[in-house]
Interface confidence: low
Amino acid sequence: ESALITQQDLAPQQRAAPQQKRSSPSEGLCPPGHHISEDGRDCISCKYGQDYSTHWNDLLFCLRCTRCDSGEVELSPCTTTRNTVCQCEEGTFREEDSPEMCRKCRTGCPRGMVKVGDCTPWSDIECVHKESGTKHSGEVPAVEETVTSSPGTPASPCSLSG
């Protein structure tokens, strides 16, 4: 089944704005920082700070730049060839299973465990059992079992059943 192009799948309002540069595609592809025109004859530059493309491509329009969420810091801005780089704020991390949000790092390890890894923007603190050295699965312990690694008392637990 071949790919079919119809007018409704093209972007009629995506014509080059006056400030956008044009060049010719090479073997049907446009370089990073550009997208291809509707007729396939021109490469049109992405708009700095608004959109980008990272590879040689035949995209009909550039990718929209990511806006860092609240709770994130911008490490580097969006350019025409590279998306914004966002990172979780200090004390929070982005988990592989839920990459859409930054989660608070735990303040300490459960009783009988020691901290061997700090909170980073991409990982929670790491805890291992004192005796065996095996890693903790990551379930949050009941509050009274928490050994805090910073001063202050842990927050009160919600009513726990079971």
Partner: nanobody, 122 residues
Framework: EVQLVESGGGLVQPGGSLRLSCAAS????????MGWYRQAPGKQRELVAE???????NYADSEKSRFTISRDNAKRTVNLQMNSLKPEDTAVYYC????????????????WGQGTQVTVSS
Amino acid sequence: EVQLVESGGGLVQPGGSLRLSCAASGSIDSINNMGWYRQAPGKQRELVAEITPRGRTNYADSEKSRFTISRDNAKRTVNLQMNSLKPEDTAVYYCNAEVRERGTSWYRPDYWGQGTQVTVSS
């Protein structure tokens, strides 16, 4: 609102074939890349194959010879023909589309279907 609906998953024996389909609908102005990703239990979601509006394809290395992606821009569908399936292909398969909604100037790459389970087992 944009919806992506997958179909075609199921249980198949090793060496068998399946054809996954995904249809995009809703307030769509245009679609750039469409693709298939998969997520096995305990693993990260990974690209299987993607296809541009003009039919240029990109496959994960391990699937290049066994899988074929195709699309119909008029119907706004993308298909994944999977042959010579192996137990390690067992995963939830997700359709992804880079969509520009009507009345907007950008497309967003984060439209996903709900996923369809593919199980390869004897």
